[in-house]
């Protein structure tokens, strides 16, 4: 029925699944499902019935708005959630929310693959290491971002003296969090400290 919303949240957080419109008037029953056929909770205009599921004890329904509150979401809660409203006419209306739960990214470690002084220029190869995650990388030299084409897990570049930076930062991020790792060099082109 076309009402599909995407939500991305951080694991361990509390989540509200709700629709952006008022519930239809005079419905007969409201039910929340996950993975299409697993009932979480049902409201019949008088009381809520919570079903045996992995959510029991972690969910609460607001019958006035239809919102479903889930506490302490984990990656295993990734699913399409469906709010189905049964009208007295027998017609059904559905809203779908695709929930993606992501762990916060860990702090990256910068590994110095190679530093080499080449004719007053500095060849630099740094890698930004985090355990297998799907993340975005942004490199900074003294807090100035490097060009977009250099933004991946490995920074490989040759710097002229006027472009030298003392410290290099790798920022890893996903849609729910970001963390930085920094390495500093002794000018012009040697390792100082991590």
């Amino acid at each position: 029925q076309g009402h599909l919303v995407h939500m991305t949240v951080v694991s361990g957080s509390n989540v509200t699944l709700n629709i952006s419109e008022s519930l239809p008037e005079n419905y007969k029953q409201l039910t929340w499902f996950y993975t299409f056929d697993q009932k979480i909770v049902e409201w019949d205009s008088r009381k809520s019935k919570y079903f045996e599921s992995k959510f029991k004890g972690r969910v609460r329904l607001d019958p006035q708005s239809g919102a479903l509150y889930i506490s302490k979401v984990q990656k295993e809660d990734n699913s399409t959630y469906i709010m189905r409203v049964l009208k007295k006419t027998g017609n059904e209306q559905e809203w779908k929310i695709k929930l993606q739960v992501l762990d916060p990214v860990p702090k990256p470690v910068i590994k110095i693959e190679k530093i080499e002084d080449m004719d007053d220029n500095c060849y630099l190869k740094l890698s930004c290491v985090i355990p297998g995650e799907s993340v975005n990388y942004t490199w900074y030299g003294d807090k100035r971002p490097f060009p977009k084409e250099l933004q991946n897990s490995v920074l490989e570049t040759t710097l002229m003296p006027h472009n030298y930076s003392r410290c290099y930062t790798c920022q890893v991020s996903n849609s729910v969090s970001s963390k930085n790792g920094t390495v500093c060099l002794s000018p012009p082109c040697t390792l100082a400290r991590s």
């Epitope: 008022s22 519930l23 008037e25 005079n26 419905y27 007969k28 409201l30 409201w43 019949d44 205009s45 008088r46 009381k47 809520s48 607001d62 019958p63 006035q64 708005s65 919102a67």
Partner: antibody, heavy 119, light 107 residues
């Protein structure tokens, strides 16, 4: 059975404030929204707005934005209406009315609280 | 906002007579109309919801009909205890609104 019991009549001077309470019993308070309705002497019913008793979020009718505040104490299943900077034209009976479980119908009403504003 | 116009404003009726009160909405509201009865010095009481759905404990002489913009509350055989003011209310859109009321008096 569902019961809504409101606080007693109030006589206030212009500029003062008043807080009307509505204590609910006989049902799960946080499952059903609470509406407020005003009836001026000899006049009809006027919807003021409602409060979501699950989240505490109020929603006000256009005429009632500003001096009127809906609030809750869910630990004692009670809704409140506070009116500040009272004017003579606020003289009315104020009703709380429970929202029906599947729509904006008022299926149970309090007995009403008369607020008189006079110098 | 949706304006609800009730007619008549006042009706004087003999017992056992049939009473018809109409409520006209300024725009279509489906079947989202409700009827309340308010006796003197009492709070309103829900009589009919969603045009024609009966309410537990309300005598069967009260019924409702209509759709779209025109709605009717019918009291089939009026009794003395039915002396009251009757209000319609719409729940189709915000803000919720009431009709101006129809006062029914027993002759």
């Amino acid at each position: 059975q569902v019961q809504l019991v409101q606080s007693g009549s109030e006589l206030k001077k212009p500029g003062a404030s008043v807080k009307v309470s509505c204590k609910a019993s006989g049902y799960t308070f946080t499952d059903f929204g609470m509406n407020w309705v005003r009836q001026a002497p000899g006049q009809g019913l006027e919807w003021m707005g409602w409060i979501n008793t699950f989240t505490g979020e109020p929603s006000y009718g256009n005429v009632f934005k500003g001096r009127f505040v809906f609030s809750l104490d869910t630990s004692v299943s009670t809704a409140y209406l506070q009116i500040s900077s009272l004017k003579a034209e606020d003289t009315a009976v104020y009703y709380c009315a429970r929202r029906h479980g599947n729509g904006n119908v008022f299926d149970s009403w309090g007995q009403g609280t008369l607020v008189t504003v006079s110098s | 906002e949706i304006v609800l116009t009730q007619s008549p404003d006042f009706q004087s009726v003999t017992p056992k007579e049939k009473v018809t009160i109409t409520c006209r909405a300024s725009q279509s509201i489906g079947s989202n109309i409700h009827w309340y009865q308010q006796k003197p010095d009492q709070s309103p009481k829900l009589l009919i919801k969603y045009t024609s759905e009966s309410i537990s404990g309300v005598p069967s002489r009260f019924s409702g009909s209509g759709s779209g913009t025109d709605f009717t509350l019918t009291i089939n055989s009026l009794e003395a205890e039915d002396a009251a003011t009757y209000y319609c209310q719409q729940s189709n859109s915000w803000p919720l609104t009431f009709g101006g009321g129809t006062k029914v008096e027993i002759k």
